[in-house]
């Protein structure tokens, strides 16, 4: 997150981190039920660990943290690397969470976000596009949902109904490492961090997010059948 601020501890209890090896964060994730996460389909890896209930970027133990393995990764069938359409994936964890103030699921919005809606995006991704600067703790940023027209003008030929754009003034944006993390609007999960321009946080190049209202049925059906 570029030019966000430290999230309040436990304010984003649905926020997850996908880790390679012992502690290499490569993507965010969102807890949507006691045993299921959502993340971006482009975050799919054969082996990874899941960390919930953690505030710090560092591997230091926190009392609220819970660690999991993914036992099933189910990318949306319409996703095709390296494209950006249908960029979501369900992850079933090896066990259910212990519900606590640090770890709680978030409800998915059934209605699509409208222009001007204020939302919160969060993550442990880079705080600049130099790729070296990571935050000490989870970062939060208020962003505004942009019109479809403005979104398409920013990225001609690249935007479809499975995406929406959101941003703020120049210099505030999600960035590398935030993929798969939550965009929460009015207390409900509206989107996932997906893509945007490089470097992050450029004028007229907003962040692009997976438009989850288009996938509510697929998410429910997939969870029920697995």
């Amino acid at each position: 997150i570029v030019n966000g601020s430290d999230c309040q501890k436990d304010a984003q209890p649905w926020q997850g981190a996908l880790l390679l090896g012992p502690n290499k964060l490569y993507c965010g994730a969102v807890l949507i039920s006691p045993q299921w996460l959502l993340t971006a389909a482009h975050c799919r890896k054969p082996v990874f660990r899941i960390r919930l209930g953690h505030h710090s970027m560092s591997p230091v133990y926190e009392s609220g943290q819970q660690m999991f393995q993914g036992i099933k990764s189910i990318p949306h069938p319409g996703y095709s690397h390296p494209g950006h359409s249908n960029d979501l994936m369900l992850i079933k964890m090896n066990r259910k969470i212990r519900d606590s103030h640090s770890v709680k699921p978030v409800e998915i919005a059934c209605d699509c976000a409208t222009e001007g809606t204020r939302c919160m995006v969060s993550g442990w991704g880079t705080t600049s596009s130099s790729h070296n600067n990571f935050p000490k703790v989870l970062q939060c940023l208020n962003i505004t949902v942009l019109s479809e027209e403005r979104c398409k003008n920013s990225y001609p030929g690249q935007i479809d109904k499975t995406m929406f754009c959101a941003g703020d003034e120049e210099g505030r944006d999600s960035c590398q490492g935030d993929s798969g993390g939550p965009v929460v609007c009015n207390g409900k999960l509206q989107g996932l961090v997906s893509w945007g321009d490089f470097p992050c946080a450029q004028r007229n190049r907003p962040g692009v997010y997976t438009n989850l209202c288009e996938f509510v049925k697929w998410i429910k059906d997939t969870m029920n059948s697995n």
């Epitope: 390679l20 290499k24 993507c27 390296p82 991704g125 790729h131 993929s179 893509w195 470097p199």
Partner: antibody, heavy 126, light 107 residues
Framework: EVQLVESGGGLVQPGGSLRLSCAAS????????MNWVRQAPGKGLEWVSY????????DYADSVKGRFTISRDNAKNSLYLQMNSLRAEDTAVYYC???????????????????WGQGTTVTVSS | DIQMTQSPSSVSASVGDRVTITCRAS??????LAWYQQKPGKAPKLLIY???SLQSGVPSRFSGSGSGTDFTLTISSLQPEDFATYYC?????????FGGGTKVEIK
């Protein structure tokens, strides 16, 4: 078959110009970032330039900055390198290479260059 | 810029030998290192990405390890087709930089 084919190399005098082309086939060219990498005779690999899939981000090695220009035409599945003010030290085989990393995607994961052309030779000599 | 230093610059080995090549970055690059193989007159070929992930179609005798600044490419049992030059490359930070190369020669 995924393929990259370079062309446009040749003999040029110091101070002259050349335009290299790289024709892509067998994959969705417009979805991938691309690079130019060169190799001087008997030497190692040197990265020259990078261009993102939508051309919104471009970078160059310091040794060619201000003299070389990378560009692409996604409709034509083509990558280009315009080389001006050429010097003897630019003599090399020039490769185009597909970058597996999408700098647009916001994961923190980096791959490398998975598809390379056969190279085209540029000789700068008087 | 990040400097990549490879060692040794050349190594003589026999078929069946275990060969280890090291690469050191001048600053930490996490796991974001790629290894390439190049044969004379040919284009480089991606062997390993993210320090230890084998590229599709690459034989399992090739393996990579390391994180931060120190990385290793290992060929567990050298085959005749493995005699080539090997390069490391750091990929997270522009400008991309390659190591100087390690030539694996027949003893």
């Amino acid at each position: 078959e995924v393929q990259l084919v370079e062309s446009g190399g040749g003999l040029v005098q110091p101070g002259g110009s050349l335009r290299l082309s790289c024709a892509a086939s067998g994959f969705t060219f417009g979805s991938y970032a691309m690079n130019w990498v060169r190799q001087a005779p008997g030497k190692g690999l040197e990265w020259v330039s990078y261009i993102s899939s939508s051309s919104s981000f471009i970078d160059y090695a310091d040794s060619v900055k201000g003299r070389f220009t990378i560009s692409r035409d996604n409709a034509k599945n083509s990558l280009y390198l315009q080389m001006n003010s050429l010097r003897a030290e630019d003599t090399a085989v020039y490769y185009c290479a597909r970058d597996l990393t999408s700098m647009q995607s916001r994961d923190y994961y980096y791959y490398g260059m998975d598809v390379w052309g056969q190279g085209t030779t540029v000789t700068v000599s008087s | 810029d990040i400097q990549m230093t490879q060692s040794p610059s050349s190594v003589s080995a026999s078929v069946g030998d275990r060969v280890t090549i090291t690469c050191r970055a001048s600053q930490g690059i996490s796991s974001w290192l790629a290894w390439y193989q190049q044969k004379p007159g040919k284009a480089p070929k991606l062997l390993i990405y993210a320090a230890s992930s084998l590229q599709s179609g690459v034989p399992s005798r090739f393996s990579g390890s390391g994180s931060g600044t120190d990385f290793t490419l290992t060929i567990s049992s050298l085959q005749p087709e493995d005699f080539a030059t090997y390069y490391c490359q750091q990929v997270p930070i522009f400008p991309y930089t390659f190591g100087g190369g390690t030539k694996v020669e027949i003893k």
